[in-house]
């Protein structure tokens, strides 16, 4: 016996209670593919979630985060509170980056300053909570005997500004 359900298009479901008639999805539900025996409940964007795209009979709603929050996970499955630059979100809220680390975004974690000496370079601009250090020429390039087509910019002593 031929399965009549395969003829049911997206936006409908195959109603076994009605001799496999294709019935439209009820309000607040959808079916994105044909041949479905049930419609899925639409996603609701509540609380810190706001609606980016309304649910239709053939596609689920899409959510975004309200101002002050940003999306995490596939299809914005979570909303996480923003922090200020120079901070990270911990179990106890937004906390300033520890000395020697920075965060130049409203999200994510504080990351260590670049270690210029690992690349044989010197610190040109000190790091802050919001900005990484800027590495300059290597100390050897700055020595008086070193030949250079253009004189290098004066470099600061390695070290970091207090927070």
């Amino acid at each position: 016996l031929q399965d009549l359900c395969s003829n049911c298009p997206a936006g409908t479901f195959c109603d076994n209670n009605r001799s496999q008639i294709c019935s439209p999805c009820p309000p607040n539900s959808f079916s994105s593919a044909g041949g479905q025996r049930t419609c899925d409940i639409c996603r609701q964007c509540k609380g810190v979630f706001k609606t980016r795209k309304e649910c239709s009979s053939t596609s689920n709603a899409e959510c975004d985060c309200i101002s002050g929050y940003h999306c995490l996970g596939a299809e914005c499955s979570m909303c996480e509170q923003d922090c200020k630059q120079g901070q990270e979100l911990t179990k106890k809220g937004c906390k300033d980056c520890c000395f020697g680390t920075f965060n130049d975004q409203k999200r994510g974690i504080c990351r260590p300053w670049t270690n210029c000496s690992l690349d044989g370079k010197s610190v040109l601009v000190n790091g802050t909570k919001e900005r990484d250090v800027v590495c300059g020429p290597s100390p050897a390039d700055l020595s008086p005997g070193a030949s250079s087509a253009t004189p290098p910019a004066p470099a600061r002593e390695p070290g970091h500004s207090p927070q």
């Epitope: 996603r43 995490l72 979570m78 996480e80 979100l89 106890k92 937004c94």
Partner: nanobody, 122 residues
Framework: EVQLVESGGGLVQPGGSLRLSCAAS????????MSWARQTPGKGFEWVSG???????YYTDSVKDRFTISRDNAKNTVYLQMNSLKPEDTAVYYC????????????????WGQGTQVTVSS
């Protein structure tokens, strides 16, 4: 069907106290973490406090030592005791499930109440 119903909001003078309640139904309350959030025109939406199923509590800095979150699993209710209220605590307060267990983070599967207005003014 999951339901969260807040109550206890109202008008209070600065320095006063209020106790918000959130009655939960439609899910296993005793094993669920719960949270309170508030929404103000100025600061937007703010995570206020959370409580794990084991009773561990968390607060945002601005309410620490003034607000206390608690739960009564027998009554399926979570509370927010608010003392030493300030005008800047004026907001709509929402109760929500807190599946992520992470400060300032909610998931799409979390459920929300309709909110209760708290106004702190002389």
């Amino acid at each position: 069907e999951v339901q969260l119903v807040e109550s206890g909001g109202g008008l209070v003078q600065p320095g006063g106290s209020l106790r918000l309640s959130c009655a939960a139904s439609g899910f296993t309350f005793s094993s669920s973490a719960m949270s309170w959030a508030r929404q103000t025109p100025g600061k937007g939406f703010e995570w206020v406090s959370g409580i794990y199923s084991d009773g561990s509590t968390y607060y945002t800095d601005s309410v620490k030592d003034r607000f206390t979150i608690s739960r009564d699993n027998a009554k399926n209710t979570v509370y927010l005791q608010m003392n030493s209220l300030k005008p800047e605590d004026t907001a709509v307060y929402y109760c929500a499930t807190w599946g992520t267990l992470r400060f300032g983070v909610w998931a799409e599967y979390d459920h929300w109440g309709q909110g209760t207005q708290v106004t702190v003014s002389s």
